[in-house]
Interface confidence: low
């Protein structure tokens, strides 16, 4: 199923014609130099592929819409009723270049297609590549693919969120969390239970891929030596090894902490202790107060010693409904003594306090290195009863279909030019003939991209 057996758009036969440049004529010095005009031609794989689809025939043929329902959701939102269409990008600069578009917002979408033949993880690498354009930006949603495990139960018209997959790969975003997933499901050789293993997050800032409304090319390369690379627009953004760079790790640790071990009561974790030989100096007065009255202070002139600070409000009247039995004896509310307003103060004058120069506080011996320090206690290690060692995690469960099972709060996510292959050269050719044209048409081609494309065409006329 390469998707190019009908309605092929044969606009030109050769990339020398596709990139139409007037090489001989000198540009008019009064006019700005024009961009090369790019004409679209549907890409064709240059070798054997497990799957390829450019959607340029304009139909969903070969793709199966899911009729499943999510089993853990209310009925009205459980159905996979999100719409898919094959159409050109809204702002397309390449007439005839169609893609698969997720049309609806706030709905579950699921669509899948069978591979030409199952991919068996053996001696050849796996390369998965496709394009995504968030035409309306993206608020919260995914654009990742699932490579669906080859099982007797696999039924594509019942494809749903619990359908077993071997690999999940691609962009995903919610809020300000921008992700590029690479997850594979590893089978525990001891228990037979599958566990998701997630690649470490890329160091690169992924935000622009989601926000710039350009078409980006996502590539996953998985090698039989367990190494992997993730590329965006043909540049590596993440790489590693299935044995060392997945979370949780593929292989559990050989040893674990003894669950029964406990810290001995006399285990000493104190790095420092009070010096047992230190002696409190004879002149250390622990009872001296921190503050003392300032003996040099004098009472301000005009201080009214006999006037209280507060007096009963002379205008206050006992409320008519005051009940002495229930409310007690009525007392007029207090107000600031009006006589004190013009004086420096009223009432009994007290000396202000100052820091006591002789205050030393409670004596503490100085700290010294603890001669009995045993370090931070850790439980002893014991052999992990659940230990196993799988040194070839690349040998994953074979997969026989590709699926998109997505929820998005933003519509019009454009997918294009899916390819699954074991040959990097074929995938690179496909990228040049598809994404490369988009890039050139966008006028975003770096210097030399057009030249590279012409060279590529000359290599395989």
């Amino acid at each position: 199923h390469d998707g190019h057996d009908d309605d092929v758009i044969d606009i030109e036969d050769d990339l020398d014609d596709v990139i139409e440049e007037v090489e001989d004529s000198k540009p008019d010095t009064t006019a700005p130099p024009s961009s090369p005009k790019v004409t679209y031609k549907a890409p064709v794989p240059t070798g054997e592929v497990y799957f390829a689809d450019s959607f340029d025939r304009g139909t969903l043929s070969g793709w199966i819409l899911s009729k499943a329902k999510k089993d853990d959701t209310d009925d009205e939102i459980a159905k996979y009723d999100g719409k898919w269409e094959v159409e050109e990008m809204k702002e397309s600069k390449l007439p005839g270049d169609k893609g698969l578009v997720l049309m609806s917002r706030a709905k579950h979408h699921a669509i899948s297609a069978k591979l030409n033949k199952p991919f068996l993880f053996d001696t050849k690498p796996l390369i998965v590549q496709y394009e995504v354009n968030f035409q309306n930006g993206i608020e919260c949603g995914g654009a990742y693919v699932k490579l669906l495990s080859k099982t007797p139960e696999l039924n594509l018209d019942q494809f749903h969120d619990k359908t077993p997959y071997t690999i999940m790969f691609g962009p995903d975003k919610c809020g300000e969390d921008y992700k590029l997933h690479f997850i594979f499901r590893h089978k525990n050789p001891k228990t037979g239970i599958y566990e998701e293993k997630h690649a470490k997050r890329p160091d690169a800032d992924l935000k622009t891929y989601f926000t710039d409304k350009k078409t980006h090319l996502y590539t996953l390369i998985l090698n039989p030596d367990n190494s992997f690379e993730i590329l965006v627009d043909q540049s590596v953004v993440n790489s590693g090894n299935l044995l060392n760079d997945m979370t949780p790790p593929v292989n559990p640790s050989r040893e674990i902490e003894d669950p029964e071990d406990r810290k001995p009561e006399d285990w000493d974790e104190r790095p420092k202790i009070p010096d047992p030989e230190a002696v409190k100096p004879d002149d250390w007065d622990e009872d001296a107060p921190a503050k003392i009255p300032d003996e040099e202070a004098t009472k301000p002139e005009g201080w009214l010693d006999d006037e209280p600070e507060y007096v009963p409000d002379p205008d206050a009247e006992k409320p008519e409904d005051w009940d002495e039995d229930m409310d007690g004896e009525w007392e007029a509310p207090q107000i600031a003594n009006p006589r004190c307003e013009s004086a420096p103060g009223c009432g009994v004058w007290q000396r202000p306090v100052i820091d006591n120069p002789n205050y030393k506080g409670k004596w503490k011996p100085p700290m010294i290195d603890n001669p009995s320090y045993q370090g931070i206690w850790k439980p002893r290690k014991i052999p992990n009863p659940d230990f196993f060692e799988d040194l070839e995690p690349f040998r994953m469960t074979p997969f026989s279909a590709i699926g998109l099972e997505l929820w998005s709060m933003t519509s019009d996510i454009f997918f294009d030019n899916f390819i699954i292959c074991a040959d990097r050269r074929i995938v690179d050719d496909w990228a040049n003939d598809g994404w490369g044209l988009k890039k050139a048409a966008d006028g975003a081609a770096e210097p030399g991209v057009v030249g590279q494309m012409i060279e590529a065409a000359e290599e395989r006329p």
Partner: antibody, heavy 116, light 112 residues
Framework: EVQLVESGGGVVQPGRSLRLSCAAS????????MHWVRQAPGKGLEWVAV????????YYADSVKGRFTISRDNSKNTLYLQMNSLRAEDTAVYYC?????????WGQGTMVTVSS | DVVMTQSPLSLPVTLGQPASISCKSS???????????LNWFQQRPGQSPRRLIY???NRDSGVPDRFSGSGSGTDFTLEISRVEAEDVGVYYC?????????FGQGTKVEIK
């Protein structure tokens, strides 16, 4: 006084469930690994399960794996044993014992009888 | 699993006489740190087990000094220097070095 008191035993039909508890007092419960050990009538002692002081690690005897679950609530100083899919051969007195490899403190035991 | 084998399984003794129980393990009980986790328990009739000896030879507090433990590697012994009436019951050895923890079958001590 350091003490462990088990409860929750009783008579139950095969295939049914039962939950045992073990209340600890007189020591810092949250510092100790805790075990369940059982003794079938007239037989010897059989280790059943262990849980680490903070509950993060648990191990089980093969004879109960997948059916029994050990857990603890350190805020309540209590150890639990959830026993599902009970069989006649699970009939025994169940003891909880304080850890540290040496099983230095034991409860008085609670009898579980599995019978139709 | 480590198998713990006790002998004899029944031990009739005369009051005041010594008694000896053997316990053999199918693997060495010396752990990587050089410690040997072999414990002895006493279970009197109708009672819970009670620890007597830990780490081969260390007596628990409150345990009479007529009880002693010895041995190394895979061979261990519990000795009662002079048996008293209160010593009647079943004695178990238990290894705490390997998972799962395993007990011996028990030795029943009774008065002749």
């Amino acid at each position: 006084e350091v003490q462990l008191v088990e409860s929750g035993g009783g008579v139950v039909q095969p295939g049914r469930s039962l939950r045992l508890s073990c209340a600890a007092s007189g020591f810092t419960f949250s510092s100790y690994g805790m075990h369940w050990v059982r003794q079938a009538p007239g037989k010897g002692l059989e280790w059943v399960a262990v849980i680490s002081y903070d509950g993060s690690n648990k191990y089980y005897a093969d004879s109960v794996k997948g059916r029994f679950t050990i857990s603890r609530d350190n805020s309540k100083n209590t150890l639990y044993l959830q026993m599902n899919s009970l069989r006649a051969e699970d009939t025994a007195v169940y003891y909880c014992a304080r850890g540290g490899r040496a099983f230095d403190i034991w409860g008085q035991g609670t009898m579980v009888t599995v019978s139709s | 699993d480590v198998v713990m084998t006790q002998s004899p399984l029944s031990l009739p003794v005369t009051l005041g006489q010594p008694a000896s129980i053997s316990c053999k393990s199918s693997q060495s009980l010396v752990n990587s740190g050089g410690d040997t986790f072999l414990n002895w328990f006493q279970q009197r009739p109708g009672q819970s087990p009670r620890r007597l000896i830990y780490k081969v030879s260390n007596r628990d507090s409150g345990v009479p000094d007529r009880f002693s433990g010895s041995g190394s590697g895979t061979d261990f012994t519990l000795e009662i220097s002079r048996v008293e009436a209160e010593d009647v019951g079943v004695y178990y050895c238990m290894q705490g070095t390997h998972w799962p923890r395993t007990f011996g079958q028990g030795t029943k001590v009774e008065i002749k």
